[in-house]
């Protein structure tokens, strides 16, 4: 199917009323016209745009575009209409930033000025130079009034500034000195926080872009969810599940009269909510619009549950994962609760929060035991590894930003909110505050914000997820706000279920088909798993008992 945004390459057709028709008959949103991006792919959305005033340091293309002045006449067309390289522009025009303009209008490299060789056809590159005897060039003592910039541009590749004593090489905006004399492009995108989502580095500058489904907020330059359902924040307060619309800021009760609900998660596509009740020792599910009716609340798991404190829904493969701090296990089940197995029953002390990345096939969890840590493994329980084990005490909530591939967590003993990339690198402490992070518990991320609940403050806070600034209170007087999730379709991007792509149903697995972590292109897409009392047979698909009926309990 054709990209809905691009409209395909079919026969001539009318675009929607809020779309612009390109010359090549593509349809693009009207707001993309004259935004200096070639969205049509034939430049027609950037032609005939109102002339805009370019900055003094820019060159104005004939079609109104602005480009860096130094790109003019550099042999590469940067203007969509090529006017930066036209004869009219480049004949007797201003030379590039690292060039000297000869009297006849031609350009030579600035470092060739005053090098005692004639480089300009008219010799003007040697005019007005201080004639230094050859023997003096090696003399380090500087005669008063000597301007080194006049000789060979001081050796600077771009800008040479004469000083009272000596001289200084500097660079135009977007460039940096590499070796005191030579300018090279600054890769602003090396800073993971240069942009809220995608950073594209160009020579001398960079540009921020957004992933599909998001659009740039022209004021803040942050990526916001494109028009669609309003995002909402759903949280538990032990006795209820509540909802806050993040746009309208209205507040509603989703599920009343609960006993002791701490953990919850959502499946956006089916509009279902999942939650654990610590007192009843059960995991439940319901459609969000019917969840307030106890008759519509389905019990999924009520066997071998002790203290299910963390819950995560794999919306792609239709599984739920939960931590149990009483049994000291991490388990998985189908979303109907019908098939389940224990993935981890060893080396867990106080497992709490859990989050899943079904796109890459990984899960992440926090453990606030004596040796607190954040761990990750494949969604099938393989490749277990520790992500964070130092400077961590009580990691209560964790959440994933699948777009930036970062994990965020709150530590209620250190009063900190931190983030780290999915491989355990680039750790950043965003906020350290006994006021705003008095006893944080749950955490969620959406767009440019991070949200967290705080038990002592009885409030939900938000802050900028890149730098921890702009802290504000979203809701207060909440009485025990615990887990928190954002409900929006962009939080759960669609992907293929590897177990369904297989020729055999359920990947040929007799019991559970679990996605495998996608570490390389050779990684298996899934593996099979069996109930806790059975073993995977030699075909790695079917389940068998050994002689002892009840021998096996949680693996790995």
């Amino acid at each position: 199917a054709a990209d809905p945004l691009l409209g395909g390459q079919g026969p001539a057709k009318e675009c929607e009323k809020d779309q612009f028709q390109c010359r090549n008959e593509r349809c693009i949103p009207s707001v993309w016209r004259c935004d200096e991006d070639d969205d049509c792919l034939d430049h027609s959305d950037e032609d005939d745009c109102p002339k805009k005033t370019c900055a003094d340091s820019d060159f104005t293309c004939d079609n109104g575009h602005c480009i860096h002045e130094r790109w003019k006449c550099d042999g590469e067309e940067e203007c969509p209409d090529g006017s930066d390289e036209s004869e009219a522009t480049c004949t007797l025009g201003t030379c590039h930033g690292n060039e000297f303009q000869c009297g006849d209008g031609t350009c030579v490299l600035a470092i060739k000025r005053c090098n005692q060789e004639q480089d300009c056809p008219d010799g003007s590159d040697e005019a007005g130079c201080l004639q230094v005897p050859p023997t003096f060039l090696g003399n380090r003592r500087r005669p008063r009034g000597l301007n080194e910039c006049l000789h060979n541009n001081g050796g600077c590749s771009h800008i040479c500034t004469d000083l009272k004593i000596g001289f200084e090489c500097t660079c135009p905006a977007g460039f940096q000195l590499l070796d005191q004399k030579t300018c090279g492009d600054i890769d602003e995108c090396k800073d993971p926080d240069a942009c809220s989502q995608i950073c594209v580095n160009y020579k001398g500058y960079f540009k921020c872009e957004c992933y599909p489904g998001y659009e740039m907020d022209l004021l803040t330059k942050n990526c916001k969810a494109a028009a669609g359902k309003s995002p909402s924040l759903i949280f538990t307060n032990r006795h209820e599940v509540r909802r806050i619309d993040l746009v309208k800021r209205n507040y509603s009760r989703l599920i009343p009269m609960l006993k002791n609900v701490v953990a919850l998660d959502m499946e956006v596509a089916t509009n279902r909510i999942y939650w654990c009740d610590l007192s009843y020792r059960k995991i439940y599910s319901a459609y969000m619009d019917k969840a307030s009716d106890p008759k519509e609340q389905e019990v999924l798991i009520d066997e071998q549950l002790h203290s299910p404190e963390g819950l995560a829904v794999d919306w792609v493969h239709k599984h739920i994962y939960w931590t149990d701090s009483g049994n000291k296990t991490i388990s998985v089940a189908t979303v109907d609760g019908g098939r389940r197995c224990t993935l981890f029953s060893r080396n867990l002390s106080e497992p709490r929060a859990i989050a899943v990345d079904p796109l890459q096939g990984f899960m992440y969890w926090s453990d606030w035991g004596n040796q607190a840590k954040i761990e990750k493994s494949g969604l099938n329980g393989v490749d277990r590894q520790t992500l964070v084990s130092d400077n961590i005490e009580w990691p209560n909530g964790i959440t994933l930003d699948l777009l930036s591939q970062r994990l965020y967590w709150v530590d209620s003993k250190l009063h900190q909110l931190s983030s780290i990339d999915f491989s355990g690198g680039n750790r950043k402490m965003l906020i350290s505050s006994t006021d705003f992070l008095s006893h944080p518990f749950g955490i969620a991320v959406f767009e440019d914000k991070v949200f967290w609940t705080d038990l002592e403050n009885e409030a939900i806070f938000s802050a900028n997820r890149l730098n921890g600034l702009e802290i504000s209170i979203l809701a207060e007087n909440l009485n025990n706000p615990h887990d928190i999730v954002i409900f929006h379709e962009l939080k759960q991007p669609r992907a293929a279920d590897a177990c369904k792509l297989s020729v055999q149903p359920n990947g040929g697995c007799e019991y559970l088909c679990l996605p495998a972590p996608q570490i390389s292109s050779h990684s298996p897409k899934y593996t099979c798993a069996c109930p806790d009392t059975m073993w995977l047979g030699p075909d790695m698909k079917r389940c068998y008992r050994d002689g002892n009926e009840d021998s096996k309990m949680g693996s790995t």
Partner: antibody, heavy 118, light 108 residues
Framework: EVQLVESGGGLVQSGRSLKLSCAAS????????MAWVRQAPKKGLEWVAT????????FYPDSVKGRFTISRDNAKSSLYLQINSLKSEDTATYYC???????????WGRGVMVTVSS | DIQMTQSPPSLPASLGDKVTITCQAS??????IAWYQQKPGKAPRLLIR???TLESDTPSRFSGSGSGRDYSFSISNVESEDFASYYC??????????FGGGTKLELK
């Protein structure tokens, strides 16, 4: 060896109630869902009730819902089936069955006959 | 609910014959089918699960196959102790559990 032994059957008048029992041995009873399956004379098998390991949830087909109640006592390794408002179509051999971890019934008792007279 | 249609209801056979019983589900059951043998006055005995997996004490002359909605059960070389009734069962970890109507294998 897994053993399931049913008891409590017999001839009962229509409209009355009856409670069947099943004594289990040879396995950890509390680890398994248990079920009752019946078979009318010269007819096929029909599943009538299942109970979860802790006894907190039970399942029935629509045909018996409201009249049949399955229960269990894990301390005694016993399964029960309470049948109320007996009808002539409840006449059958009732089998106690263990639901294996993969979902099918892997062990069965020998059955107990219930005859409902009008 | 899923219905299981088993055929034929009765199947005459001689010793040494190969016989096949079929079960058709009203919708795709993803290979979750088991086959049972029942002799008069006895409890059913599990022979095959997950379409084709033989229980450890099931003789190799028994086999099962199928996918989607259509499944079959075969005895390659009928022996005298095989004359009995056979039932298919669609199972899952959650209800309902649905049996086929049964097939009586009789001596021709």
């Amino acid at each position: 060896e897994v053993q399931l032994v049913e008891s409590g059957g017999g001839l009962v008048q229509s409209g009355r109630s009856l409670k069947l029992s099943c004594a289990a041995s040879g396995f950890t009873f509390s680890n398994y869902y248990m079920a009752w399956v019946r078979q009318a004379p010269k007819k096929g098998l029909e599943w009538v009730a299942t109970i979860t390991t802790s006894g907190s949830r039970s399942f029935y087909p629509d045909s018996v819902k409201g009249r049949f109640t399955i229960s269990r006592d894990n301390a005694k390794s016993s399964l029960y089936l309470q049948i109320n408002s007996l009808k002539s179509e409840d006449t059958a051999t009732y089998y106690c069955a263990r639901r294996g971890p993969l979902g099918y019934f892997d062990h069965w008792g020998r059955g107990v006959m219930v005859t409902v007279s009008s | 609910d899923i219905q299981m249609t088993q055929s034929p209801p009765s199947l005459p056979a001689s010793l040494g014959d190969k016989v096949t019983i079929t079960c058709q589900a009203s919708q795709n059951i993803n290979k979750y089918i088991a086959w049972y043998q029942q002799k008069p006055g006895k409890a059913p005995r599990l022979l095959i699960r997950f379409t084709s997996t033989l229980e450890s004490d099931t003789p190799s002359r028994f086999s099962g196959s199928g996918s989607g909605r259509d499944y079959s059960f075969s005895i390659s070389n009928v022996e005298s102790e095989d004359f009995a009734s056979y039932y298919c069962l669609h199972y899952d970890n959650l209800p309902p559990w649905t049996f086929g109507g049964g097939t009586k294998l009789e001596l021709k």
